[in-house]
Interface confidence: low
């Protein structure tokens, strides 16, 4: 299907930039891995990079605005022919939930005074207000709480006293029309306009201040223009070369407003100047090797040694990494593909153990399914052999850090009846639904 | 987006028999499972019977033997066919379906699900006692 194509994805916002047009497919957009596309105007922008998680979005507010609730945020898997940590699609959300508390307590409701005096009536002549208040303290609200109802209340007075009425403009009429529109007739035009002071008219008894200011107004017509004409496009130029070398690029045709040129305030020649068309190199850009994720370390072991794990004997283990993902000529991945170090084997050795301390309380799961959980545990931790941290394996090279490699079998008192983890657990409060916030924006 | 829209409700003696259908547009090469729940007033909404693209089904132990749930891929439509329909049957019959997106999010949580994501407006069935 065609897609709309992009020469930039921000990576701060998630959205695509620099339209390049429309009417291509996935694969012609991505020939160049800096682009963008969207299926549709509006939806979600994918880069043509090789696909990676999102930063995690900031967490939704509260479930609750008082005591315990749970409150969500995700990360979504972005790119293009290929897949995320865990084998995961471009476009997938990965959700995360946790308790959250805004507030411990939840407010309380308080009760009102009785009503004070009534303060004197707001005007001097004529009809007014006049106000008491009461005070929100029997008893006091707590935990940010409030009083139902008003402070205040307020009633009409009427002070018997006649008020004068002040003389205002109404407002000025319209200016009376020029003898022509556009340049030199025989007498020089003008224009008049007039008002009334009727917006009140003052008044009699008591008496009123007549309307300050004259009640005409009187101007030449000035500045009339001569009379337009409107402009005209002339032909269109030639069309720009393509401006890549790789992928697609965009190139333009210009035109002039000047079959005529627009004189005397005549309007500008409708439409636009310029008009792109997408020109495609058929070259694919290239892509530029990035390293995968360093592979397992290999057991540690010694030459000509069968074995030397639970043993004060340093042996060495090594890891690798691939370069994948370079055509077309791109760059190699820089550094080394081998790892090398040295370490001591505890490999199934039976050690001593002592339990840790409660860890935090994990994620609440499944974040998005029915009842979730959140967990922390107490774990057998194996207490270590003070072998030396360092050793110098070859003379002259200086001394080199020493690792524990494997996976010892720790052995701790029974504690609850479990011998290695000891796992508490509880339910989530209050637990707000997953949507996709891609779709709640529509 | 993917529309649901059901059809086949209706008003029926018990013993007898409804056929519902569910038929998808939009976005129809997302979907994944597709499944009927139902409401009965002041009860909690509970899964009938669902069905992987594959074609793997999956009932409520309340309708397993009564109830058989099919999908016709071509026509983007899911069915219920609901046979010796009881008085407890009578429910608001609701289709619902899984975005491919979703499926792989709750495989990655661990979640058996599905994790349905698009909802129909439902269709009422009555059985009268």
């Known amino acids: 299907d065609p897609v709309l194509c992009f020469t930039q994805y921000e990576e701060s916002s998630g959205k695509c930039k620099g339209l390049l047009g429309g009417g291509v497919s996935v694969e012609d957009c991505c020939l160049n891995t800096a682009f963008a596309y969207q299926k549709r105007s509006g939806g979600l922008c994918q880069p043509c990079r090789s696909p990676r998680w999102s930063l995690w979005s900031t967490w939704a507010p509260c479930s609750v605005t008082c005591s315990e609730g749970s409150q969500l945020r995700y990360r979504r898997c972005v790119g293009w022919n290929g897949q995320c940590s865990g084998k995961v699609a471009p476009g997938t959300l990965e959700w995360q939930l946790q308790a959250c508390e805004d507030q411990q307590c939840c407010p309380e409701m308080g009760g009102w005074s009785g009503w004070g005096p009534w303060e004197p009536c707001s005007v001097t002549c004529s009809k007014g207000t006049r106000t008491r208040r009461r005070a929100c303290n029997h008893p006091a609200p707590k935990c940010g709480g409030h009083c139902p109802g008003q402070a205040q209340e307020s009633e009409a007075c009427d002070t018997q006293q006649v008020c004068p009425t002040h003389g205002a403009w109404a407002t000025w009429g319209p200016w009376t029309p020029c003898s022509a529109s556009c340049h030199g007739g025989p007498h020089e035009p003008k224009e008049t306009r007039s008002r009334k002071c009727s917006a009140p008219e003052p008044s009699q008894k008591p008496p009123g201040k007549p309307c300050p200011g004259l009640a005409y107004e009187q101007r030449r017509c000035t500045g009339l223009p001569p009379c337009p004409v409107a402009g005209g496009w002339g032909p269109w130029g030639p069309v720009s070369p393509c401006p890549v070398t790789c992928g697609l690029g965009q190139t333009m045709e210009q035109r002039t407003c000047n079959h005529p040129v627009p004189q005397h305030g005549g309007p500008f020649c409708a439409g636009d100047a310029t008009r792109t068309h997408i020109c495609n190199t058929a070259v694919p850009c290239p892509v530029d090797g990035e390293w995968d994720s360093w592979g397992e370390w290999s057991p540690c072991i010694r030459r000509n040694m069968k074995s030397i794990s639970c043993q004060e004997i340093p042996g060495q283990q090594s890891r690798g990494r691939t370069c994948r993902g370079r055509k077309f000529d791109g760059h190699r991945c820089a550094g080394q593909q081998q790892d090398i170090r040295h370490c001591y084997s505890i490999q199934h050795c039976p050690l001593k153990g002592s339990w840790s301390e409660w860890s935090t309380w994990g994620l609440c799961m499944p974040p998005c399914g029915p009842n979730p959980t959140r967990a922390r545990q107490r774990l057998c931790t194996p207490l270590l052999p003070k072998y030396p941290p360092t050793v110098s394996m070859v003379e002259g090279q200086g001394e080199k850090n020493v690792t524990f490699w494997g996976r010892p079998l720790p052995r701790c008192e029974e504690l609850q009846g479990q011998k290695l983890v000891v796992e508490e657990k509880r339910p989530c409060l209050h637990v707000p639904a997953c949507k996709d916030p891609e779709e709640e924006e529509l | 987006q993917v529309q649901l829209v059901e059809s086949g409700g209706g008003l029926v003696q018990a013993g007898g028999s409804l056929r519902l259908s569910c038929a998808a547009s939009?976005?129809?090469?997302?979907?994944?499972?597709m499944g009927w729940y139902r409401q009965a007033p002041g009860k909690q909404r509970e899964l009938v019977a669902d069905?992987?693209?594959?074609?793997?089904?999956n009932y409520a132990d309340s309708v397993k033997g009564r109830f058989t749930i099919s999908r016709d891929n071509a026509k983007n439509t899911v069915y219920l066919q609901m046979n010796s329909l009881k008085p407890e049957d009578t429910a608001v019959y609701t289709c619902?379906?899984?975005?491919?997106?979703?499926?792989?999010?709750?495989?990655?949580?661990?979640?058996?699900?599905?994790?349905?994501?698009?909802w129909g407006q439902g269709t009422q069935v009555t059985v009268s006692g």
């Open positions: 939009g976005s129809i090469f997302d979907i994944n499972a």
């Open positions: 619902a379906a899984e975005s491919i997106r979703e499926s792989q999010n709750r495989h990655q949580l661990g979640y058996m699900g599905p994790l349905y994501d698009y």
């Open positions: 069905i992987t693209s594959s074609g793997s089904t």
